[in-house]
Interface confidence: low
Amino acid sequence: FKVTTPYSLYVCPEGQNATLTCRILGPVSKGHDVTIYKTWYLSSRGEVQMCKEHRPIRNFTLQHLQHHGSHLKANASHDQPQKHGLELASDHHGNFSITLRNVTPRDSGLYCCLVIELKNHHPEQRFYGSMELQVQAGKGSGSTCMASNEQDSDSITAA
């Protein structure tokens, strides 16, 4: 299988909810010896290898933002991500998403979704998707997020 992103750029006014989506395409291995992990993290833009660097989303690391079935895998030793305006969702068609509620410019960045396939006696396989979130400061709540299939290569000032 592979991971795709329906949109690679989201431009959202401050205060809106941003739902970033990834999709698993193709057959996923099944069986008692197969585990699929789905998670999210922030990374750096302008890298040659996208999604290499791991940064927390609103102080939550990728270990705390794992999808488990259709629900968020809660870690009792940490604050619930929902309390910090983060919600994870997934369906049976391979779509999974993270929603950031009440976004601020500090939420802007390159978001990566990661799917890890663990099979007994097989090497771990990792599949990535990436998308840019840009939050416009001081915009009214009347406008909504816009999603596009473009990468903003323009706002990266090249060396």
Partner: antibody, heavy 113, light 112 residues
Framework: EVQLVESGGGLVQPGRSLKLSCVAS????????MSWTRQAPGKGLEWVAS????????YYPDSVKGRFTISRDNAQNTLYLQMNSLRSEDTATYYC??????WGQGAMVTVSS | DVVMTQTPPSLSVTIGQSVSISCKSS???????????LHWLLQSSGRSPKRLIY???NLASGVPDRFSGTGSQKDFTLKISRVEAKDLGVYYC?????????FGAGTKLEMK
């Protein structure tokens, strides 16, 4: 060498329309967002419009939203700015820009009766 | 939108003098990748703006090292040491961390 060459400026009456063009060379045009930035006489710089690399999405400040339309022809390496319902406050030099890294020579637009 | 406040609005200098221009933003310009997308442009009389410094302190190609940029977060400075006649013009700070891009109002550098 990156080059951006604007054309289409001129004198126009309030309420009328004008279309600016910008021919780009020296870089892979269809890989980059492009923008228009303007400068009123004796004033500072103001972003006017941006367009994604395939032209799928466009962005405008409130001051021109609904009146200006940015578009592009990637086959011709050309960026456009269609300006409708022009007002005196739209009088400015309009620059075609690649980020803030590269700027065209500018096209002067004067809106006056 | 991010407001860029540039000071002073104008500077009268003599050739060989050193000067500094300040630029303050209404919010932090640090992007999530840790980089700060604050740039300095020069617009000479009757010309288009030209990039001098990108990402706070990096000199653009062909720019002499008499120009230097410093700062972090919301507070930035452009310093020109040993001003030459060709340095005269209007200096702008610009940010591309947040969409839309915004500019300072400019600082006019002129001969005393």
């Amino acid at each position: 060498e990156v080059q951006l060459v604007e054309s289409g400026g001129g004198l126009v009456q309030p309420g009328r329309s004008l279309k600016l063009s910008c021919v780009a060379s020296g870089f892979t045009f269809n890989k980059y967002w492009m923008s228009w930035t303007r400068q009123a006489p004796g004033k500072g710089l103001e972003w006017v419009a941006s367009i994604t690399n395939s032209g799928g999405n466009t962005y405008y400040p409130d001051s021109v939203k609904g009146r200006f339309t940015i578009s592009r022809d990637n086959a011709q390496n050309t960026l456009y700015l269609q300006m409708n319902s022009l007002r005196s406050e739209d009088t400015a030099t309009y620059y075609c820009t690649l980020g803030v890294d590269y700027w065209g020579q500018g096209a002067m637009v004067t809106v006056s009766s | 939108d991010v407001v860029m406040t540039q000071t002073p609005p104008s500077l009268s200098v003599t050739i060989g003098q050193s000067v500094s221009i300040s630029c303050k933003s209404s919010q932090s310009l640090v992007y999530s990748d840790g980089k700060t997308y604050l740039h300095w442009l020069l617009q000479s009389s009757g010309r288009s703006p030209k990039r001098l410094i990108y990402q706070v302190s990096n000199l653009a190609s062909g720019v002499p090292d008499r120009f230097s940029g410093t700062g972090s977060q919301k507070d930035f400075t452009l310093k020109i040491s040993r001003v030459e006649a060709k340095d005269l013009g209007v200096y702008y700070c610009a940010q591309t961390t947040h969409f839309p891009y915004t500019f300072g109002a400019g600082t006019k550098l002129e001969m005393k």
